[in-house]
Amino acid sequence: EEELQIIQPDKSVSVAAGESAILHCTITSLFPVGPIQWFRGAGPARVLIYNQRQGPFPRVTTVSETTKRENMDFSISISNITPADAGTYYCIKFRKGSPDTEFKSGAGTELSVRAKPS
């Protein structure tokens, strides 16, 4: 049985203010059972960016259809980027439970925001 890997291929992404940022994340196994969530930052101060359960997350869309079966692509797009969005984004797999528990994190993608071109 294949051990789950969470692949965030981009160490860093630079986006101009007002544009959209795509943050890539793919997984290599459907196991363990449980959801994927995106956060900005690490530790207790981290900010939830997207999951299927909470929300709405009006600026976030999933790159793949949310109804796609056996999907391994959990990339997201964040629209209308502002300097406040700068930070490191983590794609994290949770193990199903009561409550769900964090199982494994991607290495993170650092988002930097450039000034809007004049």
Epitope: E1, S29, L30, F31, P32, V33, P35, I36, N51, Q52, R53, T62, S64, E65, T66, T67, K68, R69, E70, N71, D73, F74, R95, K96, S98
Partner: antibody
């Protein structure tokens, strides 16, 4: 073609044990969660248990009495049922889970079921 | 635990007619709802998932709609093989996965 074939059902007395098996073919068994669902005579469907890789989940009504397991080398799912009660009498179906990417699981293939009767 | 309530319990319809029945969830399940058909003496068969997506091989006369707490399954022109029991199932919040009590579609 996906095929799920249950076996191991039968008539037992209350308090006894039974082990159900489900032989799977036509898909990469080790890649998918698997589930047992039961249906009492003339009643609706009731979820019993689900297994991922090693992670297991149970309905409250069977927790502590039933154990789900799998042998990926044999493409087989099991349900060990101990301390059986009259209310466990049902057809037990084995089902393959299908995962919707950001959500949960539903069941896209089902076996024909095996009947378990618990009676004194 | 999310409770699913299906109505009506029984629906009497003539062949060729339209059948519509509902599934109500006790709390919001977004679109995380599936529909199954169970013919007498057979195993359930997946018809619809994600509230509205037809499973491969399911005829177009079957359609699902709704989101949140109210869902509907519609069969536009009932064929003889459609007389069966239909169950909804939520997979938004589990364990446990929960099923509705079923709607039996019988010949009028």
């Amino acid at each position: 073609d996906v095929q799920l074939v249950e076996s191991g059902g039968g008539v037992v007395r209350p308090g006894e044990s039974l082990r159900l098996s489900c032989a799977a073919s036509g898909f990469r068994f080790s890649n998918f969660a698997m589930t047992w669902v039961r249906q009492a005579p003339g009643e609706g469907l009731e979820w019993v248990s689900t297994i991922g890789s090693g992670d297991t989940y149970y309905a409250d009504s069977v927790k502590g009495r039933f154990t789900i397991s799998r042998d990926n080398s044999k493409n087989t799912l099991y349900l060990q049922m101990n301390s059986l009660r009259a209310e466990d009498t049902a057809v037990y179906y084995c089902a393959k889970d299908s995962t919707v990417s950001w959500s949960g699981d539903f069941f896209d293939y089902w076996g024909l079921g095996t009947l378990v009767t618990v009676s004194s | 635990e999310i409770v699913l309530t299906q109505s009506p319990a029984t629906l009497s319809v003539s062949p060729g007619e339209r059948a519509t029945f509902s599934c109500r969830a006790s709390q919001n399940v977004k679109n995380d709802l599936a529909w199954y058909q169970q013919r007498p003496g057979q195993a359930p068969r997946l018809l619809i998932y994600a509230a509205r997506i037809r499973e491969t091989g399911i005829p177009e006369r079957f359609s699902g709609s709704g989101s949140g707490t109210e869902f509907t399954l519609t069969i536009t022109s009932l064929q003889s093989e459609d007389f069966a029991v239909y169950y909804c199932q939520q997979y938004y919040d589990w364990p446990p996965f929960t099923f509705g009590g079923g709607t039996k579609v019988e010949i009028k």
